[in-house]
C-alpha cells in the first residue's frame, strides 16, 4: 500500500546531546515531503514538522516533557503539492524510529572548565554546569539538576613539562587536587554517567586549560584572572 510516487523514509536516527534532540532520516526528498509523529508507549501520536522538505525534525520540545519516558517516532511521506488531496482512506507510507529514552541515551555534551584556583599546593578546579532545555515549572534545569549523583566528572591533569597524566573523580562540579609547588599544570575534564553501559556513558574531553593562562587565578603570585 502507500501513496503513489512516494518513498518511505529510512535510516531514522536519533541525534541527542544534553537533551537537545533531533530525529534524522533519509532520503533527501524528490517530489515528496514529510511529517513526523512522536508518542510515548502509552500516549497519543503528536504531529511535528508538518510537510517538511527537510530530513530532520527537532523533537526537543516533546521529549523534555518527560526525559525518563521512552519515545517512538514515525515519519510519513506525502507527494509534494498533493498534501491536502491525499485520499483519506489511503495511509501514506511511513517508517518507525528506534525507541528512544532521553535520560539513558542523550549524549553528554563536551564539558567546560569554568575556572581553577591555586592556593599553595592545592588547586580547585570547577566544571561549568551546563543548562539543558528540560524545565521544572518555568525554570530551565542544569545537567546536574537532571542527573544529580548519576553524573560524575573525571579530571585529567598533568605537569606542563611532562606527559604523565593523573586522574581524579567527583560527583560534584569541583575538584580539589594536590600539586607540586612551582609547577604549572594542565587540565581536562570529562562528564561520565557510570550507570550507563553503552558508548554514550562518557562525553568528549573538555578543551585543555593550563595554569599560567587566562582561566585560573593564583593566590601565590597575586595575579587574579577571572573567567566569565
Amino acid at each position: 500500500s502507500g501513496t503513489t510516487n512516494t518513498v518511505a523514509a529510512y535510516n531514522l536516527t536519533w541525534k541527542s546531546t544534553n537533551f537537545k534532540t533531533i530525529l534524522e532520516w533519509e532520503p533527501k526528498p524528490i517530489n515528496q515531503v514529510y511529517t513526523v509523529q512522536i508518542s510515548t508507549k502509552s500516549g497519543d501520536w503528536k504531529s511535528k514538522c508538518f510537510y517538511t522538505a527537510d530530513t530532520e525534525c527537532d523533537l526537543t520540545d516533546e521529549i523534555v516533557k518527560d526525559v525518563k519516558q521512552t519515545y517512538l517516532a514515525r515519519v510519513f511521506s506525502y507527494p509534494a503539492g498533493h498534501v491536502e488531496s491525499t485520499g483519506s482512506t489511503e495511509e501514506p507510507p511511513y517508517e518507525n524510529s528506534p525507541e528512544f529514552t532521553p535520560y539513558l541515551e542523550t549524549n553528554l555534551g563536551q564539558p567546560t572548565i569554568q575556572s581553577f584556583e591555586q592556593v599553595g599546593t592545592k588547586v580547585n578546579v570547577t566544571v561549568q554546569d551546563e543548562w539543558t532545555l528540560v524545565r521544572r515549572n518555568d525554570t530551565f534545569l542544569s545537567l546536574r539538576d537532571v542527573f544529580g549523583k548519576d553524573l560524575i566528572y573525571t579530571l585529567y591533569y598533568w605537569k606542563s613539562s611532562s606527559s604523565g597524566k593523573k586522574t581524579a573523580k567527583t560527583n560534584t562540579n569541583e575538584f580539589l587536587i594536590d600539586v607540586d609547588k612551582g609547577e604549572n599544570y594542565c587540565f581536562s575534564v570529562q562528564a561520565v554517567i557510570p550507570s550507563r553501559r553503552t558508548a554514550n556513558r562518557k562525553s568528549t574531553d573538555s578543551p585543555v586549560e593550563c595554569m599560567g593562562h587566562e582561566k585560573g587565578e593564583s593566590r601565590e603570585t597575586g595575579h587574579h584572572h577571572h573567567h566569565h
Epitope: 525518563k68 539513558l104 570547577t126 554546569d129 539538576d145 537532571v146 544529580g148 549523583k149 560534584t172 553501559r197
Partner: antibody, heavy 120, light 113 residues
Framework: EVQLVQSGSELKKPGASVKVSCKAS????????IEWVKQRPGQGLEWMGD????????NYNENFKGRATFSADTSVSTAYLQISSLKAEDTAVYYC?????????????WGQGTLVTVSS | DIQMTQSPSSLSASVGDRVTITCKSS????????????LTWYQQKPGKAPKLLIY???TRESGVPSRFSGSGSGTDFTLTISSLQPEDFATYYC?????????FGQGTKLEIK
C-alpha cells in the same frame, strides 16, 4: 498511577535466605533507581542501596555488602532484594522506593513494606 | 559517610502550633554546580511507609500542604510546620541525598501535647 507492590511477610530461620520482590507499575521502570531501605522494629530508616534496572548498576551501603544482593527483571518490572545468612538483627521491615524525577530529589514513591522475621 | 543529626528527638505540641525540626549534616550538602542543597525530608506514620515532603532542602513535593516548608543551606537545615494539623503527628526524617551512602537522621517524633 505509580505503584510499588512488595511481596508478603516472611518468617525465616537464622542462616536461611530471603528474597523480597517489588513490582513496579505506572512509569518507565528502567529509568528510575529502585532504593532499598531497612527499618528495624521501633527504629529509624537505614539505606541499604539501590539498583538502576536499565543497566543493573548498583550501589551498596557498606553495612550490607556481601549479604544483600539487588537485582531487577525488566521484563516484569520487578526489583528484588535477597539477603543471605539471616541473623536475628535482620528482623525488620524492608521497603523498596523509587527515586524522584529530578536528580537527587529523594524517594518519591514507596512500597508498602515487607516484614522479615528471623527466629529459630 | 555523612552523619545526619536531628533535634529534638521527640517533641510535644498542640494543634495550631508552629513547629520547627532541625537537621545537621557532618559535611556540606550544597552542590557547587547548581547551588542546590541535596537534603530531603520525609514523614512517617506508624505502620506506614515514609512519605516524601521536601527535596532540594526547600522544594515541596507535589501534593504536600503549604504549611510544610524547608530551609537551610550547607550543613544546617530546618523543617517548619506553620500550623499543626491532627494528621501531622508522625515521625520526621531528614536524609542526605547528596552522596553515597545515602544517610538518614535518627528521626524526630512529633506527639500530641
Amino acid at each position: 498511577e505509580v505503584q510499588l507492590v512488595q511481596s508478603g511477610s516472611e518468617l525465616k530461620k537464622p542462616g536461611a535466605s530471603v528474597k523480597v520482590s517489588c513490582k513496579a507499575s505506572g512509569y518507565t521502570f528502567i529509568t528510575y533507581w529502585i532504593e532499598w531501605v531497612k527499618q528495624r522494629p521501633g527504629q529509624g530508616l537505614e539505606w541499604m542501596g539501590d539498583i538502576l534496572p536499565y543497566s543493573g548498576s548498583t550501589n551498596y551501603n557498606e553495612n550490607f555488602k556481601g549479604r544483600a544482593t539487588f537485582s531487577a527483571d525488566t521484563s516484569v518490572s520487578t526489583a528484588y532484594l535477597q539477603i543471605s545468612s539471616l541473623k536475628a538483627e535482620d528482623t525488620a521491615v524492608y521497603y523498596c522506593a523509587r527515586s524522584g524525577y529530578y536528580g537527587n530529589s529523594g524517594f518519591a514513591y514507596w512500597g508498602q513494606g515487607t516484614l522479615v522475621t528471623v527466629s529459630s | 559517610d555523612i552523619q545526619m543529626t536531628q533535634s529534638p528527638s521527640s517533641l510535644s505540641a498542640s494543634v495550631g502550633d508552629r513547629v520547627t525540626i532541625t537537621c545537621k549534616s557532618s559535611q556540606s550538602l550544597l552542590s557547587s554546580g547548581n547551588q542546590k542543597n541535596y537534603l530531603t525530608w520525609y514523614q512517617q506514620k506508624p505502620g506506614k511507609a515514609p512519605k516524601l515532603l521536601i527535596y532540594w532542602a526547600s522544594t515541596r513535593e507535589s501534593g504536600v500542604p503549604s504549611r510544610f516548608s524547608g530551609s537551610g543551606s550547607g550543613t544546617d537545615f530546618t523543617l517548619t510546620i506553620s500550623s499543626l494539623q491532627p494528621e501531622d503527628f508522625a515521625t520526621y526524617y531528614c536524609q542526605n541525598d547528596y552522596t553515597y551512602p545515602l544517610t538518614f537522621g535518627q528521626g524526630t517524633k512529633l506527639e500530641i501535647k
